[in-house]
């Protein structure tokens, strides 16, 4: 029976400048029941405080609620293990919210063949940003990531489309079926998750761009 | 509605002691950081004390340090004061206050008035 | 301890007119300071924090400036109202000292 080892906060994620949740890995328990408690205070404060939610995150995580995050403010955070031999802390961890945003996905993923009779045809992609962002107040730019492959095939191929909610391919298989997805990342942070995939059927006589 | 409701104030002896109350409501309690702040008749306002949401962390002022306790049950969402020794100077309405999540008194109590007098 | 240094201690002042009331920490706080409002025989309210942030629902004529070691709460419209003691208060680290009040009055 020893006191337990050095737990670790290996990630801190911020969906939206809003909220976060920070996340730790337990050390080793020292054969003993161990509790866990996250303490934090802000830069240029010396004001203790605890974390105030453990249960939002999932196990051996702290969640902060909108009343809880400044984004203009360092977090400087660590975790304390103790059992009945004794405690060990976390290395501290210095959080700015700024920089660990990873949204959820974009939204409502649309994909459409367009064959104009004039021009070469082209699959239309269009999606919205994620609902939890709101980008009139001009704290986000969000960029985009599109990737789609055929049903069957391995690679993906992947377009940047800046800060565009909208993007028109030329090169595709005709008569393929592909599966097409897109993420965003702030300007500072984190890819988002794909999106679920979408299913579209290139047609047949879809001509390929020169 | 977000309420906090102090009790337990009252007239007592210099050395004597008191448990002050203080209910909360509308809010998830066990969340949140709680404070005792005071007033003396005609004067300002004094902090007394903090506790951090689990009571870990818990910080006094040098003037009540060693005589008066602040613990909290999070399960009766309540918070309380337990004050020993009091003197003619701990005479005041004393306030609970919540602690906000950027460290502001946001919600405060209707108060309890504490008479310290033989 | 850091101390909160209120001036002035009160003040009387016309309907319309422009307040402005100082707080002085005896060492830097950053911009961790707040401003409340107390009207004779009611609770304290929170009226800034952060030094500069109103908080909801207090009227736009409120407003705060200030980092560091000075700090100021100005009323750019005295209303009838507003009479009342105000207080800065510092919430960098304990213990969170209250200044000594400013009270206002109205001429």
């Known amino acids: 029976q020893l006191p337990p080892g050095k737990p670790e906060i290996f990630k801190c994620r911020s969906p939206n400048k809003e909220t976060f949740t920070c996340w730790w890995r337990p050390g080793t328990d020292g054969g003993l029941p161990t509790n866990y408690s996250l303490t934090y205070h802000r830069e240029g404060e010396t004001l203790m405080h605890e974390c105030p939610d453990y249960i939002t995150g999932g196990p051996n995580s702290c969640h902060f609620g909108k009343q809880y995050t400044s984004m203009w403010r360092t977090y400087i955070m660590m975790v304390n293990a103790t059992n009945q031999m004794g405690s060990s802390f976390s290395d501290e961890l210095y959080v700015d919210v700024t920089y660990i945003v990873q949204p959820d996905p974009p939204l409502e993923l649309a994909v459409e063949v367009k064959q104009p009779e004039d021009r070469k045809p082209y699959l239309w992609i269009k999606w919205s940003p994620p609902t939890l962002i709101d980008l009139k107040t001009g704290w986000f730019t969000l960029l985009y990531e599109i990737r789609l492959k055929p049903e069957k095939a391995a690679e993906w191929e992947i377009h940047f489309a800046g800060q565009q909610t909208e993007f028109k391919i030329l090169s595709l298989h005709p008569g393929q079926k592909y599966l097409v997805q897109v993420r965003c990342k702030p300007d500072h942070g984190y890819w988002s998750a794909w999106s679920p995939a979408t299913f579209i059927q290139i047609p047949s006589d879809f001509t390929m761009n020169d | 509605e977000v309420q906090l409701v102090e009790s337990g104030g009252g007239l007592v002896q210099p050395g004597g002691s008191l448990r002050l109350s203080c209910a909360a409501s509308?809010?998830?309690?066990?969340?949140?950081?709680m404070n005792w702040v005071r007033q003396a008749p005609g004067k300002g306002l004094e902090w007394i004390s903090y506790?951090?949401?689990?009571?870990?962390?818990?910080y006094y002022a040098d003037s009540i340090k060693g005589r008066f306790t602040i613990y909290r049950d999070n399960a009766r969402n309540s918070l309380y004061l337990q004050m020993n020794s009091l003197r003619a100077e701990d005479t005041a309405i004393y306030y609970c206050?919540?602690?906000?999540?950027?460290?502001?008194?946001?919600?405060w109590g209707q108060g309890t008035m504490v008479t310290v007098s033989s | 301890d850091i101390q909160m240094t209120q001036s002035p201690s009160s003040l009387s002042a016309s309907v319309g007119d422009r307040v402005t009331i100082t707080c002085r920490a005896s060492?830097?706080?950053?911009?961790?300071l707040a401003w409340y409002q107390q009207k004779p025989g009611k609770v304290p309210k929170l009226l800034i924090y952060?030094?500069?942030t109103l908080q909801s629902g207090v009227p736009s004529r409120f407003s705060g400036g200030g980092s560091g070691t000075d700090f100021t709460l100005t009323i750019s419209s005295l209303q009838p109202e507003d009479v009342a003691t105000y207080y800065c208060?510092?919430?960098?680290?304990?213990?969170?000292?209250f200044g000594g009040g400013t009270k206002v009055e109205i001429k």
């Open positions: 206050a919540r602690l906000s999540g950027v460290d502001i008194f946001d919600i």
């Open positions: 509308g809010f998830t309690f066990s969340s949140y950081e």
């Open positions: 506790i951090s949401s689990r009571g870990g962390t818990i």
């Open positions: 060492q830097g706080i950053s911009n961790y």
């Open positions: 952060f030094a500069s």
């Open positions: 208060q510092r919430y960098n680290s304990a213990p969170l000292t």
